[in-house]
């Protein structure tokens, strides 16, 4: 991974594009920390394992988070 100690935040660009929950392998929410003062959301896609930085402020991404958490709560006993 092209990462040096001087890199503070993971995302160079962020995307507003809606993501189909069915095409998601994984959704990571990285809270703000001493290294990066903002929340970062990284979607790993099933296709080729592509990772995409998402805009936490985007309406489409907020809806995605809701859909994913709803799906998770359905699955948990």
């Amino acid at each position: 991974v092209p990462l040096s100690r001087t890199v503070r935040c993971t995302c160079i660009s962020i995307s507003n594009q809606p993501v189909n929950p069915r095409s998601l392998e994984k959704l990571e929410i990285i809270p703000a920390s001493q290294f990066c003062p903002r929340v970062e959301i990284i979607a790993t896609m099933k296709k080729k394992g592509e990772k995409r930085c998402l805009n936490p402020e985007s309406k489409a991404i907020k809806n995605l988070l809701k859909a994913v958490s709803k799906e998770r709560s359905k699955r948990s006993p």
């Epitope: 001087t6 503070r8 995302c11 160079i12 660009s13 962020i14 592509e50 995409r52 930085c53």
Partner: antibody, heavy 124, light 109 residues
Framework: QMQLVESGGGVVQPGRSLRLSCTAS????????MHWVRQAPGKGLEWVAV????????FYVDSVKGRFTISRDNSKNTLYLEMNSLRAEDTAIYYC?????????????????WGQGTTVTVGL | EIVLTQSPGTLSLSPGERATLSCRAS???????LAWYQQKPGQAPRLLIY???SRATGIPDRFSGSGSGTDFTLTISRLEPEDFAVYYC??????????FGPGTKVDIK
């Protein structure tokens, strides 16, 4: 459509300064990392600098470290390159380029939108 | 620092022929970090391929990318007149820096 327009190039004496600007339109500028890439006459492409979408990180090629500064004003949809202590070897066409949507340190989507470039000539 | 080498320096072909361009890295590069660009005289570069094999938006399917580790290839299945240009590979490496190869010129035979 998505567009980048560079300005600020010109002829300058060695040791002097110049500030390049790149104005973006047709996309949400504040969402994308931005680069400066240069091309000396008759030569290949050389990456110069990158700035994260929110200005959180900035990185430079070794040959310009300490002389060039990349910055951005998201309220004006504008990217800048402050060039100090210019040398003859800085003579080139300078392009600004947009980092692809969603790029991060784990996956790179390439520089997907380019300006037409502005020419910088350093000479006596 | 990873150095990219492109071969051949110049490729002389006719329209309709297949072009195979090589990009070799001095150390292993993740395919997630490899891109290809096309540049025509007097124009800005254009992104063709990212992630070693994914076509950028609007790029015709005659362009394809492949490879992993230190060896990557850009293939143009059937050269069209507008494909004669210089092609650059590029990698995103640690620090982070974004290195371009020296380019391959595809010209008309």
């Amino acid at each position: 459509q998505m567009q980048l327009v560079e300005s600020g190039g010109g002829v300058v004496q060695p040791g002097r300064s110049l500030r390049l600007s790149c104005t973006a339109s047709g996309f949400t500028f504040s969402n994308n990392g931005m680069h400066w890439v240069r091309q000396a006459p008759g030569k290949g492409l050389e990456w110069v600098a990158v700035i994260w979408f929110d200005g959180m990180n900035k990185f430079y090629v070794d040959s310009v470290k300490g002389r060039f500064t990349i910055s951005r004003d998201n309220s004006k949809n504008t990217l800048y390159l402050e060039m100090n202590s210019l040398r003859a070897e800085d003579t080139a066409i300078y392009y600004c380029a947009r980092e692809g949507d969603g790029s991060g340190i784990y996956y790179y989507y390439g520089m997907d939108v380019w300006g037409q470039g502005t020419t910088v000539t350093v000479g006596l | 620092e990873i150095v990219l080498t492109q071969s051949p320096g110049t490729l002389s072909l006719s329209p309709g022929e297949r072009a195979t361009l090589s990009c070799r890295a001095s150390q292993s590069v993740s395919s997630s970090y490899l891109a290809w660009y096309q540049q025509k005289p007097g124009q800005a570069p254009r992104l063709l391929i990212y992630g070693a094999s994914s076509r950028a938006t609007g790029i015709p399917d005659r362009f394809s990318g492949s490879g992993s580790g230190t060896d990557f290839t850009l293939t143009i299945s059937r050269l069209e007149p507008e494909d004669f240009a210089v092609y650059y590979c590029q990698q995103y490496g640690s620090s982070p820096i974004f290195t371009f190869g020296p380019g391959t010129k595809v010209d008309i035979k």
